[in-house]
């Protein structure tokens, strides 16, 4: 049942190129060498793709031609180390090219960037865009791969493949369209978002695998999949955790052909047995490739079993819970996570977690006891504060949304963390509070039993990226500790922490405050963000100011930014009432 | 290869006692959930009873609940059913199962064990 023992291929590039055909092939290498090289100009990167795609086509013809048996990494490495301005485009990354594999992959891994200084991609006109589309379809596509790619370097490859095929079915359907800005713009406008919520999901799964080990990644998806797929066996859940570990841990080290490959295979595989899966996959199942891979990694988790047993009888009242756990502790453990995680899809992943690391520490205790019946007879009790607090936390939090709407929310949110973190730059600030502040619209329209596995878990995800941004120029212990002691708890940890008394606030500098008429010309979304970037630079200077202080002082500027966009002379508005409005913001919270 | 090799089925009369026994091979026993189902002339398949992976949980059939009882020893891959005071109406043809609440009527049952219970 291994779907990936393979037989050893004398080339793997060749391999590669025939199971994922050629189209697949010189895509997953753009975006593996766009992930890597993630300043190099697009031009670059197509010169590079088709050496590689030409010498994968000598090895097909000759698998024992020369270099054809070289790794992947050997191959794409060597072929990176050739790019003429590394050193003065990338620094210290060109020292990468002086290691040997494996250590020079893992050098490149690790000059991954998530934060790359690139300019924000601005969307053409739609007439723009249909005629480069229609003057040559292949570019545009490779650029779309390529733009994505340098800007989230741990982008799910395959994943990537569908959001370009949906994006290719965009401008073939509008650009033929009589209203094409009507009928394409939404659909860019879904791919973005849901673009970039697939990027920070990825992104928390390989930091979950590089910052924590396989053991915790097999984990969150041993809970997952039990979750999904309650019906499943345990050997089933087991085979497919380790399928899809191996599929996620190649991605993630930048092996995206054998991802690719390995991805492909184990959504075959699953069609194959859906019968002993779930009764949900039946729709995905019937789909093309890309779109079955994606069907089946987002479907609703099937029914529970009718009638499953207490859950004590095998964890607490059996007389070899210390045996079997001594045994096989890992399968004991997994087989408690299978458990009670099918039993409760209204749970997150991460308090099943949080459960199955209290249930592991009793019996660390227990087991070495002297009556360890009597020691762990309890251990069921110790969840019942676990539950209650992400539920508490919810159902505080989503009382505030419904009365607040998600702006205002953002930004009881943004003051919230400001306080809790100073230290951390505003941009990242604005960043993660704004998409914490989403989970209202998010998961609060959910029912009860679908609200914490969808916030939770949602915030797991947001604050992996403050924690990946963080720790690219860390400013703050407070951030690195609930970053770095428990994935699971990063969420409680962040909650947890009270206003920061130690930061000294910083000096106010009248220039953060100054805005001018361009303000006016930007979108909904982009004038927030400007109000958003002050008012952390506000708590910055004043941490102990009131939320009462700070929504006067918000509202005044709301409402000048309002009166200088329909004033005739803009610019001299906002000069003017902007010294008188700094001024007051200055006498009103003491400044 | 899955194999499920039963054996201890026979006549037996109403109140009396039968133990029904299913030697496992060809795959992880204990990572399993078992069952008993059985099939009665001319009717379809009926779930008796499932026990969990590690033992302690049991369920049945409201039809066989206080008279049957399922249990495993993963040490030796067996899976058991001890029917007491047995009915007319128990007489049915007794697989054993891999897997529970549902998957067991897609598993390859292989060959019963038939059970007859008459005066």
């Known amino acids: 049942r291994g779907v990936f023992r393979r037989d050893a291929h004398k080339s793997e590039v060749a391999h590669r190129f025939k199971d994922l055909g050629e189209e697949n092939f010189k895509a997953l290498v753009l975006i593996a060498f766009a992930q890597y090289l993630q300043q190099c100009p697009f031009e670059d990167h197509v010169k590079l793709v088709n050496e590689v795609t030409e010498f994968a086509k000598t090895c097909v013809a000759d698998e024992s031609a020369e270099n054809c048996d070289k790794s992947l990494h050997t191959l794409f490495g060597d072929k990176l180390c050739t790019v003429a301005t590394l050193r003065e485009t990338y620094g210290e990354m060109a020292d990468c090219c002086a290691k040997q594999e494996p250590e020079r992959n893992e050098c490149f891994l690790q000059h991954k960037d998530d934060n790359p200084n690139l300019p924000r991609l601005v969307r053409p006109e739609v007439d723009v865009m249909c005629t480069a589309f229609h003057d040559n379809e292949e570019t545009f596509l490779k650029k779309y791969l390529y733009e994505i790619a340098r800007r989230h370097p741990y982008f799910y490859a395959p994943e990537l493949l569908f959001f370009a095929k949906r994006y290719k079915a965009a401008f073939t359907e509008c650009c033929q369209a009589a209203d094409k800005a009507a009928c394409l713009l939404p659909k860019l406008d879904e791919l973005r978002d849901e673009g970039k919520a697939s990027s920070a999901k990825q992104r928390l799964k390989c930091a979950s695998l590089q910052k924590f080990g396989e053991r915790a990644f097999k984990a969150w998806a041993v809970a997952r999949l039990s979750q999904r797929f309650p019906k499943a066996e345990f050997a089933e859940v087991s085979k497919l955790v380790t399928d899809l570990t191996k599929v996620h841990t190649e991605c993630c080290h930048g092996d995206l052909l054998e991802c690719a490959d390995d991805r492909a295979d184990l959504a075959k595989y699953i069609c194959e047995n859906q019968d002993s899966i779930s009764s949900k996959l039946k729709e995905c199942c019937e789909k093309p490739l890309l779109e079955k891979s994606h069907c089946i990694a987002e479907v609703e988790n099937d029914e529970m079993p009718a009638d499953l047993p207490s859950l004590a009888a095998d964890f607490v009242e059996s007389k070899d819970v210390c045996k079997n756990y001594a045994e096989a502790k890992d399968v004991f453990l997994g087989m408690f996570l299978y458990e009670y995680a099918r039993r409760h899809p209204d749970y997150s992943v991460v308090l099943l977690l949080r459960l199955a690391k209290t249930y592991e520490t009793t019996l660390e205790k227990c087991c070495a006891a002297a009556d360890p019946h009597e020691c762990y007879a309890k251990v069921f009790d110790e969840f019942k504060p676990l539950v209650e607090e992400p539920q508490n936390l919810i159902k505080q939090n989503c009382e505030l949304f419904e009365q607040l709407g998600e702006y205002k929310f953002q930004n009881a949110l943004l003051v919230r963390y400001t306080k809790k973190v100073p230290q951390v730059s505003t941009p990242t600030l604005v960043e993660v509070s704004r998409n914490l502040g989403k989970v209202g619209s998010k998961c609060c329209k959910h029912p009860e039993a679908k609200r914490m596995p969808c916030a939770e878990d949602y915030l797991s995800v947001v604050l992996n990226q403050l924690c990946v941004l963080h720790e690219k120029t860390p400013v703050s212990d407070r951030v690195t500790k609930c970053c770095t002691e428990s994935l699971v708890n990063r969420r409680p940890c962040f909650s947890a922490l009270e206003v920061d008394e130690t930061y000294v606030p910083k000096e106010f500098n009248a220039e953060t405050f100054t805005f001018h008429a361009d303000i006016c010309t930007l979108s909904e979304k982009e004038r927030q963000i400007k109000k958003q970037t002050a008012l952390v630079e506000l708590v910055k200077h004043k941490p102990k100011a009131t939320k009462e202080q700070l929504k006067a002082v918000m509202d005044d500027f709301a409402a000048f930014v309002e009166k200088c966009c329909k004033a005739d002379d803009k610019e001299t508005c906002f000069a003017e009432e902007g010294k008188k409005l700094v001024a007051a913001s200055q006498a009103a919270l003491g400044l | 290869e899955v194999q499920l090799v039963k054996s201890g089925g026979g006549l037996v009369q109403p109140g009396g006692s039968l133990r029904l026994s299913c030697a496992a091979s060809g795959f992880t026993f204990s990572h399993y959930q078992m069952s008993w189902v059985r099939q009665a002339p001319g009717k379809d398949v009926e779930w008796v009873s499932s026990i969990s992976m590690l033992g302690g949980g049991t369920t049945y059939a409201d039809s066989v609940k206080g008279r049957f009882t399922i249990s495993r020893d993963n040490a030796k891959s067996t899976l058991v059913l001890q029917m007491n005071n047995l009915k007319v109406e128990d007489t049915a043809v007794y697989y054993c199962?891999?897997?529970?609440?549902?998957?067991?009527?897609?598993?390859?049952l292989g060959q019963g064990t038939q059970v007859t219970v008459s005066s």
């Open positions: 199962a891999r897997g529970f609440s549902g998957n067991y009527y897609r598993a390859d």
